[in-house]
Interface confidence: low
């Protein structure tokens, strides 16, 4: 499996999806896990429903929200509220029995909020948007970031 | 793959308002990134004016903070600039460009011309 | 707002020669996260300006290898290896550290 990046803005959120084979995977359900080392386990953050046909209901753990639509094949992961500790080695996974199938790895990156980068060199003007909060991401920006792309820069 | 487009008057008057609409596809404006006007004197010289980013939040040039807006039409996948009370000095090739954070401008509409004249 | 100083104005050069393109900001483009945001443009006469390098010395997708940038702190040089007819037009440096993002005034790379 190839490892997938989705970078987000520190503070903002960012999903993360996993598209898959819906017949192949049909009946099962699904988790999202973190890699604890280059080889070591994959420790299960939060997975789908317990009854397969609610899997479209968003579980949460804590930050973490996953749902799957097992029609079209999509499992999405939301990160909440993005800190530099969420960056990591994560696997979507498909669940029969005991076992697990990776469906895709997924690099986190944490950026600073490029629209919220406050320097003396450069201050920002609060005035023209309420909330930087809310802005776009750094690198990628926050929300969804596309595979392999990079969304924003940070301004200091 | 994502595609700029500008579209507006070609000729303003001076201390008229000038506005231009930057439609996008192939890509949602709400889903990420920053969406950028940027002008290009006649000269060469580039300036960026201004973002809107994907949730609303605007950032302005300080040099034309008070005579720009930048607005979006979310339903239409467009957004929009409003520079008010222009002069001749207004006259430029305007471009919309979408940000892309570490990649800076990746994408870039192709441009429409915007002279100030009475 | 961080002034980018390009040079030289105008490089005129032979097919096949290298050529080398300076760039100083009048302050720092290392970004508090430790990235540089300093980005590399090329624009073809009657064409929009396209994304060359970013992030100092990363190739965007698509430019050849004779395209190489470098640099750190507030000085940077984009270098071609070997000029080709293609690569002639007008080299803009740009940095996105600071919030208001700033270019160079550009380079014409022109035949000799």
């Known amino acids: 499996h190839n490892t997938t990046v989705f970078q987000g803005v520190a503070g903002q959120s960012l999903q993360v999806s996993c598209p898959y084979d819906s017949m192949k995977h049909w009946g099962r359900r699904k988790a999202w896990c973190r890699q604890l080392g280059e080889k070591g386990p994959c420790q299960r953050v939060v997975s789908t429903h317990n009854l397969w046909l609610l899997s479209f209901l968003r579980r949460w753990n804590g930050s973490t929200a996953i749902t799957d639509d097992t029609l079209g094949g999509t499992l999405t992961i939301t990160l909440r509220n993005l800190q530099p500790h969420d960056a990591g080695l994560y696997q979507c996974q498909s669940l029969h029995g005991s076992e697990a199938d990776t469906l895709r790895k997924v690099l986190v990156e944490v950026l600073a909020d490029p629209l919220d980068h406050r320097d003396a060199g450069d201050l920002w003007f609060p005035g023209e948007s309420e909330s930087f909060e809310d802005a776009h991401v750094e690198h990628s920006i926050s929300r969804s970031l596309l595979e392999g792309e990079i969304p924003f820069p940070p301004t200091s | 793959d994502v595609q700029l487009q500008e579209s507006g008057p070609g000729l303003v008057k001076p201390s008229q308002s000038l506005s231009l609409t930057c439609t996008v596809t192939?890509?949602?404006?709400?889903?990420?990134?920053?969406w950028n006007w940027i002008r290009q004197f006649p000269g060469n010289r580039l300036e960026w004016m201004g973002y809107?980013?994907?949730?609303?939040?605007?950032s302005y040039n300080p040099s034309l903070k008070s005579r720009i807006s930048i607005t979006r039409d979310t339903s239409k996948n467009q957004f929009f600039l409003q520079l008010n009370s222009v002069t001749t000095e207004d006259t430029a090739t305007y471009y919309c460009?979408?940000?892309?954070?570490?990649?800076?401008?990746?994408?870039w509409g192709q441009g429409t011309l915007v002279t100030v004249s009475a | 707002d961080v002034v980018m100083t390009q040079t030289p104005l105008s490089l005129p050069v032979s097919l096949g020669d290298q050529a080398s393109i300076s760039c100083r900001s009048s302050?720092?483009?290392?970004?508090?996260?430790?990235?540089?945001?300093l980005h590399w443009y090329l624009q073809k006469p009657g064409q929009s300006p396209k994304l060359l390098i970013y992030?100092?010395?990363n190739r965007f997708s698509g430019v050849p290898d004779r395209f190489s940038g470098s640099g750190s702190g507030t000085d940077f040089t984009l270098k071609i290896s070997r000029v080709e007819a293609e690569d002639l037009g007008v080299y803009f440096c740009?940095?996105?550290?600071?919030?208001?993002?700033?270019f160079g005034s550009g380079t014409k790379l022109e035949i000799k």
């Open positions: 460009a979408r940000w892309n954070g570490n990649y800076g401008f990746a994408y």
């Open positions: 192939g890509y949602s404006i709400t889903s990420d990134y920053a």
């Open positions: 809107i980013s994907f949730s609303g939040s605007t």
């Open positions: 302050q720092s483009l290392v970004h508090i996260n430790g990235n540089t945001y």
């Open positions: 992030k100092v010395s």
């Open positions: 740009s940095q996105s550290t600071h919030v208001t993002f700033t």
